[in-house]
């Protein structure tokens, strides 16, 4: 028998520095977690103690904090090289800055192979990107070799900016021939490493003949055997065992997100490459694990540029940006309009001639808007200003919901109106009229939504049975502020870009902004 230790991360999302327990900015260092310096300590400890170790990343290193905004992926290559990752799969967020924003900082600089079997380049890009990412890699480990096949969510064109010269194929269809090639090469230990979410990970384990282990990402799935060490609630045991169509037991793993845990899986193979046993658990990277001093020093060196960036002007406002709770928790506020407009703008993807865009709607809890921005400071808007408006380090995500769920959400928005509660929704691509004289749960009297399958966008009444795409904060997607119906009834959820980054990019693009209160939210006569 031959034993392999797989160390894995996924959805790190730019958390190079240690974070608080909820993966936001570290405040009390003695209680902070994660970060590449701490990760390195643990990885090195395991490498010294065990003979056959692979360190793998399942994608979405890009996007999530000011580190990515400033360094644009150079930080990912630099610190992953320093940690000596063995391989990485491409995630959807790796395309956030377009293909060039992937090629130059990461694909050309990474010292480890970057993988995806289901992304095919065409046209002029084919020769430019040739060899910079691969469908599979044969990694020598000790006296054996291990095959790694990569995959990426085929929804990436709707979630990021891969352009028109990359084709995202069905994962299972694309993986099978690559696994077959590895088998032909007499590589009999094969890991599928990828970024399509836990449901697809399980399908790959079930359907792709020859895959022995699946290491996934995208869905931020936390798996654990035993008593979990922090706040995350396990979606299942670690590893999660799938019985393949040909009768094999295939371990599937994921390690939550944000570098909070290091996935740790031990696999025992027989001489024919069959999995005899698999066990492990994610390791919580808490403050009991010291940060490696040399990596920490490097982080501090790179940090300097971030501090300078946060005070630079992004753009100007010529109007007061009303982000006060007195406005945003009671009525339409122009800060809410600005943020929603930025959220839609960030999701412009012309992937189908029938649609002007794939999504037109935004909802945003008024309680998530934490500060106004005064235009009387020469109109200057900085990252620092935006961090006061959106201090929680969330993301603006894409969900699919039925009209009936949206209706429930808008009823919830005003179910206890007048108490300055955070659930009052700011909107984009939506016209809502409330009648507060009616009883809670029956206050939405008009709800019109902007069409997507149209050449001239216009507002049509919401259809209860229709499925709509909506951009919203991850806080709402996870049922925050009492929006349990969103969490319970959503049909799809893909995590998006860092909230501040979305708004800052929009302001930089627009240069001068002047959002208005324009009648997106109305109250029918006699009730307000």
């Amino acid at each position: 028998a031959w034993e392999l230790t797989i160390l894995h991360t996924n959805d790190v999302h730019s958390r190079l520095e240690q974070t608080s327990e909820d993966s936001s900015k570290c405040v009390n260092a003695s209680r902070c977690m994660g970060g590449v310096a701490r990760l390195f300590t643990k990885v090195q400890q395991i490498r010294r103690a065990e003979p056959n170790v692979l360190l793998l990343d399942a994608g979405d290193q890009y996007q999530g904090t000011i580190w990515f905004t400033v360094y644009k992926g150079a930080e990912v290559a630099h610190f992953m090289n320093a940690l000596r990752y063995d391989a990485m799969a491409l995630g959807n967020h790796e395309f956030d800055n377009g293909v060039e924003g992937l090629i130059e900082p990461l694909l050309k600089e990474a010292k480890f192979p970057i993988l995806s079997a289901n992304i095919k380049a065409k046209g002029p890009l084919a020769s430019q990107i040739s060899g910079l990412y691969l469908p599979y890699k044969v990694l020598p480990v000790g006296d054996e070799v291990v095959g790694i096949v990569g995959y990426t969510s085929k929804e990436t064109p709707f979630l990021s900016n891969p352009g028109t010269n990359l084709v995202f194929e069905d994962e299972i269809t694309a993986l099978q021939p690559e696994v077959d090639k590895l088998k032909t090469l007499n590589v009999n230990k094969i890991i599928a490493l990828g970024h399509s979410g836990f449901e697809m990970d399980k399908l790959i384990a079930q359907k792709v003949r020859g895959v022995d282990v699946v290491v996934g990402g995208h869905s931020n799935t936390f798996l654990y055997t035993g008593n979990p060490p922090s706040k995350e609630v396990p979606a299942g045991k670690y590893p999660f065992i799938v019985t393949s169509d040909d009768g094999r037991k295939v371990p599937v793993v994921q390690a939550y997100a944000f570098g909070k845990y290091l996935g740790y899986l031990k696999i025992e193979f027989d001489e024919r490459g069959n999995v005899i046993s698999s066990h492990g658990n994610p390791i919580l990277l808490n403050s009991s694990i010291p940060e490696d001093p040399s990596i920490k020093a490097d982080i501090n060196k790179w940090r300097i540029k971030l501090d300078n960036y946060s005070t630079q002007e992004l753009g100007k406002t010529i109007v007061y940006l009303d982000g006060s709770s007195q406005s945003c928790r009671f009525r339409e506020c122009n800060m809410g309009n600005l943020i929603c407009d930025a959220m839609i703008n960030n999701n412009l993807r012309h992937t189908d001639e029938m649609f002007w865009n794939h999504v037109s709607m935004c909802i945003l809890n008024g309680g998530g808007i934490r500060s106004p921005i005064d235009e009387r400071n020469n109109g200057t808007i900085t990252w620092e200003n935006l961090a006061a408006v959106l201090p929680f380090g969330g993301t603006f995500d894409l969900v699919q919901l039925k009209g009936s769920t949206l209706k429930k959400a808008f009823e919830h928005s005003v179910h206890r109106y007048g108490q300055s509660t955070g659930e009052f929704l700011q909107v984009g691509g939506i016209h809502v009229v409330y009648d507060l004289s009616r009883k809670p749960g029956d206050r939405v009297v008009k709800l019109d939504v902007l069409c997507t399958k149209c050449r001239v966008p216009s507002y049509d009444p919401l259809k209860m049975d229709e499925v709509y795409k909506v951009i919203l904060p991850n806080f709402l997607a996870n049922g925050g502020d009492g929006f349990q119906m969103i969490k319970d009834e959503l049909l799809r959820h893909d995590s998006g870009d860092q909230d501040i980054n979305v708004v800052s990019t929009y302001i930089s693009k627009m240069k001068v902004i002047y959002p208005a209160v324009e009648g997106r939210i109305k109250f029918s006569t006699g009730s307000h």
């Epitope: 050309k108 010292k111 599979y136 020598p140 090639k181 032909t184 090469l185 007499n186």
Partner: antibody, heavy 119, light 107 residues
């Protein structure tokens, strides 16, 4: 573009050792295997072994095990092939090569290094 | 070790001819076969890998086929620059081995 530049011709006495270098450029050295192949005068091609500069693991043709040593210097993007206990049978052109996809054919070759073993 | 036997060892042909070279493996190698062209004093050049995939920049007149133990390299219309020695190689089992070569000469 991918280039592999090998060291110059060598003349060695029987029993001696030779070390041939192969400097890679135009790609990330640590991400691809370097293969070594030799061709004796007027003969066919013979695979010696490979090294993966990403973690310095090696694999040898049993015929060369114990005599050939493959190493790499990642800071210089250079691979080396050392062959010891030379005999006249080792007179050959030695090539380094790189693939496009792991193992699947040698796509890029060095220009070759002629090693002559003669007393 | 897996032996690869190429036939013919020598082949005389004219410009424009269709040329077929075969490579027989002593045991099955699935499709783990590559084909190379070598000219005197030069390093080999990869033509085909995975038995039938043309390497970037290789003219479409070169094609490969076969699986298991029998493989063929076909040049659909021989050009003056195609006169060279051709080698097959298997990378399915260690040690990786080459055929003895087929020299294509001008008739």
């Amino acid at each position: 573009q991918v280039q592999l530049q090998q060291s110059g011709a060598e003349v060695k006495k029987p029993g001696a050792s030779v070390k041939v270098s192969c400097k890679a450029s135009g790609y990330t050295f640590t991400r691809y295997y370097i293969y070594w192949v030799r061709q004796r005068p007027g003969q066919g091609l013979e695979w010696i072994g490979w090294i993966y500069p990403g973690n310095f693991n090696t694999k040898y043709n049993e015929k060369f095990k114990g005599r050939a040593t493959l190493t790499a210097d990642t800071s210089a993007s250079t691979a080396y092939m050392e062959l010891s206990s030379l005999t006249s049978e080792d007179t050959a052109v030695y090539y380094c090569a790189r693939d496009v996809y792991d193992y699947a054919g040698f796509a890029y070759w060095g220009q070759g290094t002629l090693v002559t073993v003669s007393s | 070790d897996i032996q690869l036997t190429q036939s013919p060892s020598f082949l005389s042909a004219s410009v424009g001819d269709r040329v077929t070279i075969t490579c027989k493996a002593s045991q099955g190698v699935a499709t783990a076969v590559a084909w190379y062209q070598q000219k005197p004093g030069k390093a080999p050049k990869l033509l085909i890998y995975w038995a039938s995939t043309r390497h970037t920049g290789v003219p479409s007149r070169f094609s490969g086929s076969g699986s298991g133990t029998e493989f063929t390299l076909t040049i659909s219309s021989l050009q003056p620059e195609d006169f060279a020695t051709y080698y097959c190689q298997q990378y399915s089992s260690y040690p990786w081995t080459f055929g003895q070569g087929t020299k294509v000469e001008i008739k």
